[in-house]
């Protein structure tokens, strides 16, 4: 025998209290598929979250983050504070990248400068907190008298790989 609830479309639920009649989802709830016995509560975008898409009877609300924050996790489950380029987020907030690392975005973590010597190249432009090093031709390719830029040795930081 066919389940009468299977006839209930999205945006409704199969109301057991009313002889399995298809009733519309109450305000602030939705059902995104047919045949549902209950409607789901709409997500509310509060605090650092802001509404990107309003809830409807057939689809949940979608949130993004207020300015100064960015989304993290599936469906923007968290809002994380933006930092400036050259910084990364820690427990205490935004901190400058350690020597030998950089971040060219407002989010994410500081990453080490590229190790140019891995490809047999030299450092053409030094790295900064905001930018990676630029690798140039291999030292052997440099014309006589030319020299590559060597970054200063870090002071008391853990050993960064040689450039």
């Amino acid at each position: 025998l066919q389940d009468p609830c299977s006839n209930c479309p999205a945006g409704t639920f199969c109301d057991n209290n009313r002889n399995q009649i298809c009733s519309p989802c109450p305000p602030n709830s939705f059902s995104s598929a047919g045949g549902q016995r209950t409607c789901d509560i709409c997500r509310q975008c509060k605090g650092v979250f802001r509404t990107r898409k309003e809830c409807s009877s057939t689809s949940n609300a979608e949130c993004d983050c207020t300015p100064g924050f960015h989304c993290l996790g599936a469906g923007c489950s968290m809002c994380e504070q933006d930092c400036k380029q050259g910084q990364e987020l820690t427990k205490k907030g935004c901190k400058d990248c350690c020597f030998g690392t950089f971040n060219d975005q407002k989010r994410g973590i500081c990453r080490p400068w590229t190790n140019c010597s891995l490809d047999g190249k030299s450092v053409l432009v030094n790295g900064t907190k905001e930018r990676d090093v630029v690798c140039g031709p291999s030292p052997a390719d440099l014309s006589p008298g030319a020299s590559s830029v060597t970054p200063p040795a870090p002071a008391r930081e853990p050993g960064h790989s040689p450039q």
Epitope: K91, C98, G100, C110, R111, P112, N115, S161
Partner: antibody, heavy 121, light 112 residues
């Protein structure tokens, strides 16, 4: 499913080198730090260093500078740790671990199963 | 050098509550997150608490983490102790964001 699978146990002679591999799967290998940590028998966890596979950039703990070398092969999503001039005190289980990109002081969310390196004459 | 100091061992009976401390010798315990790992014999560490007080999915709510700035230390508390909680526990924080620091580890024995 994120996984870090390490190479098998090794027995080495003092003065020789060992190379341990850590094959990553289930995530974008180039977008997360891989840390190397070791644990001597009956001892605690000790940081060796870390690599950013995206560009091969590395950091080494002071104790391991000049002896440890980290590399990463992005084509196979495998990180390597080579330790040279081995001595008996290097006998330990060596772990690779992944750090999320949420913050600069985050935890290690996935660990390899560990590789036992025994240094004995 | 930054160090995290843990008691070498703690023991308690099943059903009781135990707290493992992790004291920072210099700097401010509030500067960087503290994380806690459980390690059973022959196994890799697994995360029990991350970012001071958060529990990963699958970790029972009997495990909780806290920070006490007055004593410059972090704590892992396990309530309703079970025999399966017997393991080594390690705290983990940072000296700088590229230099992780681990506590020496605490062996938890569940009596009985």
């Amino acid at each position: 499913e994120v996984q870090l699978v390490q190479s098998g146990a090794e027995v080495k002679k003092p003065g020789s080198s060992v190379k341990v591999s850590c094959k990553a799967s289930g995530y974008t290998f180039t977008s997360y730090y891989i840390y190397w940590v070791r644990q001597a028998p009956g001892q605690g966890l000790e940081w060796i260093g870390n690599i950013w596979p995206g560009n091969g950039g590395t950091f080494y703990g002071e104790k391991f500078m000049g002896r440890a070398t980290f590399t990463a092969d992005t084509s196979t999503s495998t990180a390597y740790m080579e330790l040279s001039s081995l001595r008996s005190e290097d006998t330990a289980v060596y772990y690779c671990a992944r750090r999320p990109d949420y913050s600069g002081d985050d935890y290690f969310d996935y660990w390899g199963q560990g590789t036992l390196v025994t240094v004995s004459s | 050098n930054v160090m995290l100091t843990q008691p070498h061992s703690v023991s308690e009976s099943p059903g009781k509550t135990v707290t493992i401390s992790c004291k920072l010798n210099s700097g401010n315990i509030g500067s960087y997150y503290v994380h806690w790992y459980q390690q059973r014999p022959g196994s890799s560490p697994t995360t029990m608490i991350y970012r001071d007080d958060k529990r990963p999915d699958g970790v029972p709510d009997r495990f909780s983490g806290s920070i006490d700035s007055s004593s410059n230390s972090a704590s892992l508390t396990i309530s309703g102790l079970k025999t399966e909680d017997e393991a080594d526990y390690y705290c983990h924080s940072y000296d700088s964001t590229i230099t992780p620091v681990f506590g020496g580890g605490t062996k938890l024995t569940v009596l009985g």
